[in-house]
């Protein structure tokens, strides 16, 4: 039978043993027992007698000095087995043994749950000696106890290279309810069931679980621990926690929110990061996510033209990170730019539109009617040109790029030149004679520098030659043009 | 709050017994602990007589085993000393305490009572 | 028994000063000791138990260490009331004390 020390009724389980001259002579109790100073080594040892324990883990002494008689075997006296006390109460149990002093060199440890305990415990060893045997008490003290000092606590002794061991004292430490698990935080579908979960444990056992939503209780009768509440659904928030009761009281756990997924907010704080002629980086601030992750995100953009059909182009993209880089716009044009996201359950309302333009572009034509001649008199290469037919949005033509490339002999070298819009001709000093000059031109807007015109060649020959007739631009598909001498 | 007072004859003739009681107040005897004798001869240290608990479990001091009976009254929440056979030697403040079982069985005394001092003389 | 040693058994001190007591036990007592201050006509009061822990409502100048044979009891600055004299007590068996160590007023 279990011996239950409650704290409510004794500070510490008592030492329940006989102590050095006084030890026990009646066995009526375990916890105070009457004693005499004489030594009785049968009722001491014989493990036939009451109230004693007898676990089989004991030491067998040899003959005695003198050599005429037996010990009797050596174990632990029995103590309170299970005490059962409050957290954050000081508790103190002990193990006794009564060794005959022809032992020498006892040592006794404690170990819980099948663990030796060192170190950080109030542990306290205590002999006392009288004419024929020494009474050892050993004492383990807990102050404010713990749920982890929940365990089986046993003393071992080792003497003449046996281990005795004591029978096990169980400590119980109750207290209010400890949630193992409590219900978390939830999004949910409007009108869709889900399941919120609340396990708690003492000791004391049962702990029964009542649910609350809203600060009022949803089931009229306890469900013992663990406890799944079904919600059948929900229109609109709710905060639901669960209360733990056992004997020592209730324990509330957090309380949490139950939120209804809805469509995202608008996206806010559409910005423009950088524009080119044919692309806009923009960048948005999310709107909240309506207690659903954003799955994607939808650029819209509309090209702000009277003359354009104002249809919409629509670029989706990642709903992370917040910034899209919108491709294939026109060059020095107007757009109108929104954003909107979605989750799962639909799509954000598009953010506020806002302005943004694409800057000038590249020419998108050569210049036409290249001709080259050499004029040997001056030494140089006179070459003429038209000027493309360039659209608006490739902006104002701001002058021309030349490429003259010079060959001879393994030698080839590149010049640029720039002139100005007004031109339509140009001179360039001969670099080099005996060579061929390969000519190309460019226009140039303040959106960059168009595609180069054909090349046009020219041989320039050694000095003394005379002049010949120019080098064109080919009609379209001739060959390349070659002034043949 | 806790408190101990000794009481008995303060003068014993040699070879008679010496008989003195403490009454505690503030705390039942029977609640648990050691509650002990510690007798001081004068100008000397403190010497250790013997303990007992609420039960009657008895510890003594083994100089003195052999002429000690210390026992306890839990009705009266008091427990008494006898010493027989008292010489000149045993003249002395005699002091009753509680034993403090915090760590162990028998630990520190807290609180003494005033003590009382004993004088052995015919 | 165990038998415990104080030293000095006297000794003469300024207030301001700081005092050692020692105490070596015959046997090893782990950490089984506590530390008294008695002064004239009045019983023992108990400063320092499990040998380094200092007992509720007294002064933190007082301090103890020692494990095992040796023990100490330290008062770092001595003040007009620590005038007494001063029991060490073991509590490893059957309890004894020291022979005292009276501190006087130099």
């Known amino acids: 039978a279990i011996t239950e020390a409650r704290e409510e009724a004794k500070p510490y389980p008592l030492f329940p043993g006989p102590l050095p001259g006084s030890l026990q002579t009646d066995h009526t109790s375990l916890l105070s027992l009457p004693h005499t100073s004489g030594y009785q080594p049968a009722l001491m040892f014989s493990p036939t007698q009451p109230g004693r324990p007898y676990t089989g883990n004991v030491a067998i002494p040899r003959v005695t000095s003198a050599g005429s008689k037996l010990l009797p075997p050596l174990a632990f006296k029995h103590t309170v087995g299970h005490i059962i006390l409050s957290e954050h109460k000081d508790v103190k149990f002990n193990c006794s043994i009564s060794v005959p002093n022809i032992y020498q060199d006892t040592t006794i440890s404690w170990w819980k749950d099948g663990k030796e305990l060192l170190g950080a415990h109030h542990a306290i060893t205590q002999f006392y000696p009288d004419d024929e045997v020494t009474a050892i008490i050993a004492s383990f003290s807990i102050t404010s106890v713990q749920r982890s000092d929940n365990g089986s606590y046993i003393c071992k002794m080792k003497i003449n290279n046996e281990e005795i061991v004591s029978d096990p004292i169980y400590i119980e430490v109750q207290g209010l309810p400890h949630f193992t698990k409590q219900p978390e935080s939830m999004n949910v579908t409007r009108n869709t069931a889900f399941n919120l979960t609340c396990q708690a444990v003492g000791p004391p056992e049962p702990v029964n679980i009542f649910w609350v939503q809203n600060s009022s209780r949803v089931n009229e009768q306890p469900e013992k621990s663990p406890s799944v509440l079904t919600v059948p659904g929900l229109t609109e928030m709710a905060v639901f926690s669960c209360e733990a009761h056992n004997d020592k009281g209730l324990t509330v756990s957090k309380g949490v929110q139950i939120n209804i997924k809805a469509i995202p907010s608008p996206p806010t704080e559409v910005s423009i990061h950088n524009s080119t002629a044919h692309s806009i980086l923009i960048s948005w601030v999310p709107g909240f996510d309506g207690y659903s992750p954003f799955r994607n995100c939808s650029v819209q953009v509309k090209e702000v033209d009277p003359l354009s059909n104002g249809s919409v182009m629509i670029f989706n993209t990642s709903a992370s990170p917040h910034m899209y880089q919108i491709k294939q716009l026109q060059a020095l044009a107007n757009y109108s730019i929104g954003v909107s996201c979605m989750n799962e359950i639909g799509w954000s309302a598009v953010s506020p539109w806002i302005l943004a333009s694409t800057t000038e572009g590249a020419p998108s034509v050569a210049p036409l009617n290249v001709t080259v001649f050499l004029n040997e008199s001056r030494d140089n290469v006179d070459i003429r040109w038209m000027k493309p037919l360039t659209k608006r949005q490739a902006g104002e033509l701001v002058g021309y790029r030349i490429s003259h490339v010079w060959q001879s002999a393994g030698i080839s070298k590149e010049l640029l030149e720039e002139v100005g819009q007004n031109n339509s001709r140009a001179q360039i000093s001969v670099q080099v004679h005996n060579a061929t000059c390969t000519v190309r031109i460019a226009a140039v807007t303040k959106g960059g520098v168009g595609p180069f015109s054909d090349p046009v060649k020219i041989f320039i020959p050694a000095h003394g030659w005379v002049d010949h007739a120019p080098s064109s631009t080919p009609a379209p598909g001739n060959a390349d043009p070659v002034l043949i001498i | 709050q806790l408190q101990l007072q000794e009481s008995g004859p303060g003068l014993v003739k040699p070879s008679e017994t010496l008989s003195l009681t403490c009454a505690v107040s503030?705390?039942?005897?029977?609640?648990?602990?050691?509650w002990g004798w510690i007798r001081q001869s004068p100008g000397k240290g403190l010497e250790w007589i013997g303990s007992?608990?609420?039960?009657?479990?008895?510890y003594y001091s083994p100089s003195l085993k052999s002429r000690v009976t210390i026992s306890v009254d839990t009705s009266k929440n008091q427990f008494s000393l006898k010493l027989n056979s008292v010489t000149a030697a045993d003249t002395a403040d005699y002091y009753c305490?509680?034993?403090?079982?915090?760590?162990?069985?028998?630990?520190?005394?807290?609180?003494w009572g005033q003590g009382t001092l004993v004088t052995v003389s015919s | 028994a165990i038998q415990l040693t104080q030293s000095p058994s006297s000794l003469s001190a300024s207030v301001g000063d700081r005092v050692t007591i020692t105490c070596r036990a015959s046997q090893g007592i782990s950490s089984a000791l506590a530390w008294y201050q008695q002064k004239p006509g009045k019983a023992p009061k108990v400063l320092i138990y499990?040998?380094?822990s200092l007992e509720s409502g007294v002064p933190s100048r007082f301090s103890g260490s020692g494990s095992g044979t040796d023990f100490t009891l330290t008062i770092s600055s001595l003040q007009p009331e620590d005038f007494a004299t001063y029991y060490c007590?073991?509590?490893?068996?059957?309890?004894?004390f020291g022979q005292g160590t009276k501190v006087e007023i130099k």
């Open positions: 007992v608990d609420h039960s009657g479990s008895t």
């Open positions: 499990d040998a380094s």
């Open positions: 007590q073991q509590f490893r068996s059957y309890p004894t």
């Open positions: 503030g705390y039942s005897i029977s609640s648990g602990n050691y």
């Open positions: 305490a509680r034993n403090t079982m915090i760590r162990g069985v028998m630990d520190w005394f807290d609180p």
